[in-house]
Amino acid sequence: LVPHLGDREKRDSVCPQGKYIHPQNNSICCTKCHKGTYLYNDCPGPGQDTDCRECESGSFTASENHLRHCLSCSKCRKEMGQVEISSCTVDRDTVCGCRKNQYRHYWSENLFQCFNCSLCLNGTVHLSCQEKQNTVCTCHAGFFLRENECVSCSNCKKSLECTKLCLPQIENVKGTEDSGTT
């Protein structure tokens, strides 16, 4: 089976690697622009240079290309707790990340938010906090896990999942209610 190729891929595959087919003359292969530059003018003829210009401040290209414009640099989203790990350069986009003792929670493929790693108070660390995953906690007796925090069984209502973990405490609460003590 031949993979389906888009028009641009089809045109590029006619030329050797590092070259692209001239958009107005498919008998000419022009040299692609280096990363950090963009295509200003196609090469006028075979063996002649492509006119590539360096990306302006605030834009970049990270690989060889024949783009008419450089790509805009990403901005780190402060309101998501992101910090700039490295600034944008002509050949590399901004790199955003989280502070120490924080992890990335991905809301979608490219949008992440920084949250503090759980400290496992009233529990123990089962798995340490990682770049893209919060600490996994195991709670001490008398506590249950709710949204990755160890919460006292006194906060466990009968209708909740925690009843299995907090069964003795729940029974005690039920017993005191039944006996009518205040």
Partner: nanobody, 119 residues
Framework: QVQLQESGGGLVQAGGPLRLSCAAS????????MGWFRQAPGKEREFVAA????????YYADSVKGRFTISRDNAKNTVYLQMNSLKPEDTAVYYC????????????WGQGTQVTVSS
Amino acid sequence: QVQLQESGGGLVQAGGPLRLSCAASVRTFSSYAMGWFRQAPGKEREFVAAISWSGGSTYYADSVKGRFTISRDNAKNTVYLQMNSLKPEDTAVYYCAVLHEDLYEYDYWGQGTQVTVSS
């Protein structure tokens, strides 16, 4: 473009409650996580709370944990922020956002809704 309309803000006494709503005009609302943010005068916009597409997971800023509750109604394309035990430091303009890179534009925010907590 996604249209977000926040409402429910107002003036409230410290210790009082307020419920904010955010109506989103996006066909696939139930596919996206939603968030609330706020901005006080002279301060940067900050995260308040977020909720997953299903409503199964919620996240809160430490400053509002135990006081604020985020919820959603996918049938109504609406996300809510129930704010209890309000403090003067909660005074800000509150904004909601779709938490997805295709829809959540860095420079796009709704008009927001003003919340003022008096002591």
